[in-house]
Interface confidence: medium
């Protein structure tokens, strides 16, 4: 889940937490981040990054415990870090990335946190103990569980699924403002001696905020915006307002270099090296910055500032945000990128504007014809119609364009000649006194998936050729084999003759040459990402998923692929989870991806699996997965015993009881059974997956998974008074597959 520096999730906790098993995996480039808060009126648990170090604060009743990671290990390095905090039986343990970092005794009281859990930030919670805590997380929580339950569900609309690209974007990646409420906040812009703000702006917004920095005194600010398509800067300093306009239009969708320079004497805005500045009147004295530098949009406070201002900076403009992008951002000479932002709203990594406009406007017309060439290509918006000047020869009467374009058809991965029929003149060249060699083509934008190869000396570098070259088959398109069924070339066509003709032909006309790619069906293949050997424990089952084998087919989606298991169907060890006992001789790629299939070992030597996969037209060559069944080995990992007061109950946790097996990449079922009668109490298991308030009942068997989930306990039921500590010897046996380890 992605948190953008001002977001959080809340999770209710209705009852006190006796044990805590908290696991977080996060990544951030910010040295400050609030990761998690479990909040009560006084009791609380806080995990935060501060100066790149992880700090844990646990307050239970009157007691306070603090743990932190070493100063030399900074966790604000954009790399995912795994944090595990356990509080069990009066002992707190913190580990990061598998290394024990700190542990300490804690009071045995439960943690009373009725206000709930706050993930990534504290929202509007205003509790005294939250003063001085870190900023909300700007980064990713890849996982967050408390006592085995996810804390990241359900996501709210402003916390996004997955880990956003912008958190790993380097300084050379543009800030994309995708609107309508986009905003990026950076550390304050200090202008004590002088301040500079530089970026390359691409936008079509005629009215939009660009930069806002509030001052320490109420009402002071620096504000730069686009006003009626031009740059404007306003500096409000105490009693005086300085207002500056620049005359270079910027709302044209083209990149413009913008520089804002301010010092005690003057303010200067420069667009594409064209400067506008105030006279050296010294109005500006130093503006003490307060809060963040806001780019591309305004928060509520900044909007209020501007709406209250006597210049009447219009409400529409203050509520809108920039639609466009800023590249090469630098603040006081220091490069800044999305990674350095303190918070972002509705941002994208990179500047996609030009490309999208181009794709949508120019390419969209041809989508319908991506697989079959139409009888007649629809009227194109390119080239712009040419209006011939008066007094030209009659051949140019009703002339609008030089060429009629037809799509070039090429096989996937193949080649096709550019021929006369693709670029046919609309008029008789001889009558117009034009030669084919005078009709000059230049490639202004190449195809995405192929190359126009010119068999003419020097032409390949210049990307220029003539209509005569086309007739002589000197230009051919070579497709790169990718799967898209349509592409295009942008050609500029001009005429070099010195005869009377419309001036648009001298200047050149732009044409789109659509390229239609006829797909070729590639057969699928089976690949084994971790090698073609699978190890399974005897008499157990192991999931078969894409981590074991998968299909690779460049031109078929998973939905269109079917696997077959070759060989006799009787005794076939592949089954669907929900149809135990029924061999699965055929299954879909979707089923494989969904984890619906298992390999079941029922004894004897394991059966190898030979598969093939088909896309409905072609099948892959058979591929064999070698399967080896090994006898389960069970080893006691922990068996510590418990101490508890008579009449009380105590959970049995992995720290008290756990076993290890020799399973390789296999989550095996480990069953514990009580083999002897108990004298002083009973073993109990909790229903409903560990929900507080769920019933406990006596049990003679439980799984290791139950222990891991805190669902097993020993209850002392002995009513007699003893002058000594009684000892209950709990005799257990462990079973994995058909292997049993007794007298545990």
């Amino acid at each position: 889940a992605s948190f953008f520096g001002e977001n959080h999730l809340e999770v209710p906790v209705a009852t006190a937490l006796t044990d805590i098993d908290l696991q977080l995996q996060f990544s951030t480039s910010q040295p400050e981040a609030l990761l998690l808060l479990a909040a009560g009126p006084a009791d609380h648990l806080l995990l935060q990054l501060y100066s790149g170090r992880l700090q844990v604060r646990l307050v239970l009743g009157q007691e306070e415990l603090r743990l932190q990671t070493p100063a030399e290990t900074l966790l604000s390095d954009s790399i995912p870090h795994t944090v595990v905090l356990t509080v069990v039986e009066g002992w707190a343990t913190l580990s990061v990335d598998g290394f024990l970092n700190a542990s300490s005794a804690v009071p045995g009281a439960p943690l009373e946190v009725p206000y709930g859990l706050f993930v990534g930030g504290t929202g509007t919670l205003g509790l005294p103990y939250l003063r001085g805590t870190s900023r909300p997380l700007r980064g990713c929580l890849h996982a967050a569980t408390l006592n085995g339950r996810s804390l990241l569900r359900p996501l709210t609309p402003d916390v996004h699924e997955g880990c956003a690209e912008e958190f790993s974007a380097s300084d050379d990646v543009a800030l994309g403002f995708s609107g309508p409420h986009s905003l990026a906040a950076f550390p304050a812009w200090g202008t004590q001696d002088e301040g500079t703000l530089e970026f390359t702006l691409t936008t079509q917004s005629r009215q939009a905020p660009l930069a806002f920095q509030a001052g320490g005194r109420r009402g002071d600010f620096i504000y730069v915006d686009i006003f009626e398509g031009h740059l404007r800067a306003v500096v409000e300093k105490g009693q005086g307002t300085v207002l500056l306009h620049n005359s270079v239009p910027v709302a044209d969708g083209q990149p413009h270099e913008v520089s804002v320079h301010i010092n005690a004497h003057r303010l200067e805005i420069s667009v594409d090296q064209y400067p506008t500045h105030t006279s050296n009147r010294g109005v500006l004295s130093y503006l003490e910055p307060r809060g963040s530098l806001l780019l591309g949009g305004l928060d509520a406070e900044a909007s209020r500032h501007l709406q209250e201002h006597r210049l009447g900076l219009t409400p529409e403009a203050t509520n809108a945000s920039l639609l466009g992008c800023m590249e090469d951002l630098s603040v006081n000479g220091q490069r800044r990128g999305l990674r350095e932002a303190l918070l972002t709203r509705n941002m994208a990594a990179g500047c996609r504007l030009e490309e999208e406009e181009y794709e949508d406007d120019a390419y969209g017309h041809y989508e319908a014809f991506s697989t079959l060439a139409p009888e007649a290509w629809p009227a194109m918006e390119l080239p712009e119609p040419c209006v011939p000047e008066p007094g030209l020869p009659p051949v140019f009467a009703n002339f609008t364009q030089l060429l009629t374009i037809s799509p070039l058809v090429v096989a996937e991965g193949g080649t096709a000649w550019l021929e006369w029929r693709h670029v046919q003149p609309t008029l008789d060249l001889m009558e117009a006194e034009l030669r084919k060699s005078q009709v000059l083509f230049s490639v202004t934008r190449g195809a995405r998936h192929g190359e126009l190869e010119l068999d003419i000396p020097g032409a390949q570098a210049r990307k220029m050729f003539t209509l005569l070259d086309v007739v002589n088959r000197k230009a051919r398109f070579i497709h790169d084999g990718s799967e898209d069924t349509s592409d295009q070339l942008v050609l500029e066509v001009s005429v070099t003759a010195r005869v009377p003709m419309p001036s648009c032909l001298r200047r050149g006309q732009t044409y789109l040459l659509p390229i239609q790619v006829n797909p070729v069906n590639d057969p699928p293949h089976i690949i084994f990402p971790h090698g073609s050997l699978m190890v399974i424990l005897e008499h157990t089952q192991k999931p078969l998923g894409p981590e074991v084998f998968q299909a690779y087919d460049p031109d078929s989606a998973c939905e269109g692929l079917t696997f077959q298991v070759l060989g006799t169907s009787s005794g076939l060890p592949v089954e669907r989870r929900d149809q135990p006992g029924e061999p699965a001789t055929e299954f879909s790629c979707r089923e494989l991806e969904a984890g619906s299939l298992v390999y079941v070992h029922r004894g004897g030597p394991a059966q190898d699996l030979t598969f093939r996969v088909s896309d409905g037209l072609q099948a892959s060559p058979p591929a064999t997965l070698k399967v080896v069944a090994i006898r389960p080995a069970i080893q006691i990992h922990r068996s510590t015993g418990l101490r508890l007061a008579q009449g009380s109950a105590m959970p049995i946790l992995p720290a008290n009881l756990s076993v290890e097996t020799n399973a390789v990449g296999q989550d095996v079922s480990v069953l514990f059974r009580v083999t002897g009668a108990l004298q002083f109490g009973e073993l109990q298991k909790q229903g409903a997956g560990g929900v507080e308030g769920a019933e406990w009942w006596a049990t003679q068997a439980f799984h290791q998974r139950d222990v891991e989930q805190g669902r097993v306990r020993y209850l002392s039921t002995d009513p007699q008074h003893h002058a000594y500590d009684t000892v209950e010897n709990l005799a257990l046996e462990v079973q994995v597959g058909q292997e049993i380890l007794s007298n545990l």
Epitope: E10, V11, P12, V13, A14, T15, A39, P114, Y115, G116, L117, G123, T124, L125, L146, N147, R149, S150, L151, R153, P154, L155, T156, P157, G689, G690, V691, E692
Partner: antibody, heavy 122, light 107 residues
């Protein structure tokens, strides 16, 4: 014994208003997030609103279909949750249930009121 | 919004039958799915949560499985009191949504 006792409901004309109440007993009301879920033959079960705790600033979430028309609220001192409905439409007809969840296991509804019928018709 | 599609909508079965109801989500919801049982004139009651965990007091004949987009509720041996309508619900993201329901009737 947990109990969610609902009141309100009845017949109302399109464009009219109505307030539903839900009184809770058997658990610490102030620790539980409260919700309203409605049921109609046309749309089946439909979650419509959620209100969180005082400590969560009484955060509210609504289904798109009722946003701006329905307001969920709570009074912890009375262990009560409310649903104020204005500008009612025919499609708001159905049985309205008050529900709760209070466990970090997940946002599923572990306690339900008996339901109250709202009919919007002229 | 995440759509939940339950199948079948109606199901006729006899006492003792094994019954399976499926719930398909329009996008990945991990295991954040709950199942409810509703009898005529009554409010729904929780059966399972987190796709496979039984709620307190729910008989062991009810079980659930699945993760991602496909979930199943299985009643291993149908009892007379199990004839009712069953609903799935996702709590992976807002708005919380329910399936259309499966009515289990006596054959």
């Amino acid at each position: 014994q947990v109990k969610l006792q609902q009141s309100g409901g009845g017949l109302v004309q399109p464009g009219g208003s109505m307030k539903l109440s839900c009184v809770v007993s058997g658990f610490t009301f102030s620790n539980y997030w409260m919700n309203w879920v409605r049921q109609s033959p046309e749309k089946g079960l439909e979650w419509i609103a959620e209100i969180r705790l005082k400590s969560n600033n009484f955060g509210r979430y609504y289904a798109e279909s009722v946003k701006g028309r329905f307001t969920i609220s709570r009074d912890d001192s009375k262990s009560s949750a409310y649903l104020q409905m204005i500008n009612l439409r025919a499609e708001d007809t159905g049985i309205y249930y008050c529900t709760s969840y209070g466990n970090y296991v997940g946002h599923y509804f572990d306690h339900w009121g008996q339901g109250t019928t709202v009919t919007v018709s002229s | 919004d995440i759509q939940l599609t339950q199948s079948p909508s109606f199901l006729s079965a006899s006492v003792g039958d094994r019954v399976t109801i499926t719930c398909k989500a329009s996008q990945n919801v991990d295991t954040n799915v709950a199942w409810y049982q509703q009898k005529p004139g009554k409010a729904p009651e929780p059966l399972l949560f987190s796709a496979s965990y039984r709620y307190t007091g729910v008989p062991s004949r009810f079980s659930g499985s699945g993760s991602g987009t496909e979930f199943t509720l299985t009643i291993s041996s149908l009892q007379p009191e199990d004839f009712a309508t069953y609903y799935c619900q996702q709590y992976n993201s807002y708005p919380l949504t329910f399936g259309g329901g499966t009515k289990v009737e006596i054959k």
